[in-house]
Amino acid sequence: PVSQPDAPGHQRKVVSWIDVYTRATCQPREVVVPLTVELMGTVAKQLVPSCVTVQRCGGCCPDDGLECVPTGQHQVRMQILMIRYPSSQLGEMSLEEHSQCECRPKKK
Amino acid sequence: PVSQPDAPGHQRKVVSWIDVYTRATCQPREVVVPLTVELMGTVAKQLVPSCVTVQRCGGCCPDDGLECVPTGQHQVRMQILMIRYPSSQLGEMSLEEHSQCECRPKKK
């Protein structure tokens, strides 16, 4: 399908400031991480999927001198299909995931 | 609280391949967009929040020759607190949000 903007007459409602603020605050949020040779080695010639999603701290802090950093983290293990034509194998990999975040003073 | 990894004895379960794959596919997902002077003008000296979240296409495609692109989009309006000391004002801004995504051949 051709890229479609919404119909011009269709006026979306405005997202309220409190909702904008709440969603934007520093918190764990799902991010896409591309898989690299460092993570997955040199034997696999293709990985399916070639990226994964993990929870990482993101969003903004109320002051320029603060940054959003993890204060709780753990390793999460995931199954990845490793393809080395003509065979493939389900392997596992591990990535750091953030479970708690805080706005902390930026390191000088 | 100091940054805490999980207790060493606590072995998390492995995320199955189908779950990893489903979450990683090309789809609209929430991303954090920093607000800039270009977007908000030069009068406001501070914006609260200083970033917003919008739905944008992201994730990976099954082939290196494909990329995740929007096939449906719309403008979303949001309230932002614009501060110009000593006064402040609720303003509105508009950003593009993606509602549909597809893996399409990369442009040469």
Epitope: L39, M40, G41, T42, V43, M82, R84, Y85, P86, S87, S88, Q89, L90, G91, E92, M93, S94 | -
Partner: antibody, heavy 116, light 107 residues
Framework: VQPQQPGAELVKPGASVKMSCKAS????????IGWVTQRPGQGLEWIGD????????NYNEKFKNRATLTVDTSSSTAYMLLSSLTSDDSAVYYC??????????WGQGTLVTVSA | DIVMTQSQKFMSSSVGDRVSVTCKAS??????VAWYQQKQGQSPRPLIY???SRCSGVPDRFTGSGFGTDFTLTISNVQSEDLAEYFC?????????FGAGAKLDLK
């Protein structure tokens, strides 16, 4: 499924040896064929592998200048040519059929003795 | 190159015992590890792949575990036919590399 290898080869120092490995047709065309060496009383060392369908190879850098892997698809046979032999090369050389990149099926091995 | 270290060169066990063979990779290899058994005068035989998946025909007294850099092959209820040398192998990155081996003998 076990690949077939000749039992032994006697070669002179400085010479070359070409070892063979015959596998069943279907397995041969759809698997990576690897070579692993084991010196007497020692551990195992991977030399390299070849995909008969394309002729694509991977080599252990340690053997890259002296080992050459080839295949004859018509006879479902893989070959390893090892050149400039010294007494250190006296060892058993296994032909292996790889599953992904672990060694699923091992030949009986060819014992190469380098001696004047 | 990734170095696979098997710290025990020799292990002694009685029939019916449980014995563990360990292997440490010099860098993270996820679950890309296999284990092999080699009896005197024979070719190696695969026991485990993907760190914990048992190869077909391998008795269930052989189990593999581990992730990242630390791996273990456990033989529960050791039998006399388990007298052999055990090797680990990583297939995360080229060149594929093996541990030096651990010999199991019976008391």
């Amino acid at each position: 499924v076990q690949p077939q290898q000749p039992g032994a080869e006697l070669v002179k120092p400085g010479a070359s040896v070409k070892m063979s490995c015959k596998a069943s047709g279907d397995t041969f065309t759809n698997s990576w064929i690897g070579w692993v060496t084991q010196r007497p009383g020692q551990g195992l060392e991977w030399i390299g592998d070849i995909f008969p369908g394309s002729g694509h190879t991977n080599y252990n850098e340690k053997f890259k200048n002296r080992a050459t892997l080839t295949v004859d698809t018509s006879s479902s046979t893989a070959y390893m040519l090892l050149s400039s032999l010294t007494s250190d090369d006296s060892a058993v050389y296994y032909c292996v059929i790889e599953n992904y990149a672990w060694f699923a099926y091992w030949g009986q091995g060819t014992l190469v003795t380098v001696s004047a | 190159d990734i170095v696979m270290t098997q710290s025990q060169k020799f292990m002694s066990s009685s029939v019916g015992d449980r014995v563990s063979v360990t292997c440490k990779a010099s860098q993270n290899v996820n679950t890309n590890v296999a284990w092999y058994q080699q009896k005197q005068g024979q070719s190696p035989r695969p026991l485990i792949y993907s760190a914990s998946s048992r190869c077909s025909g391998v008795p269930d007294r052989f189990t593999g575990s581990g992730f990242g850099t630390d791996f273990t092959l456990t033989i529960s209820n050791v039998q006399s036919e388990d007298l052999a040398e055990y090797f680990c192998q990583q297939y995360h990155s080229f060149p594929l590399t093996f541990g030096a081996g651990a010999k199991l003998d019976l008391k």
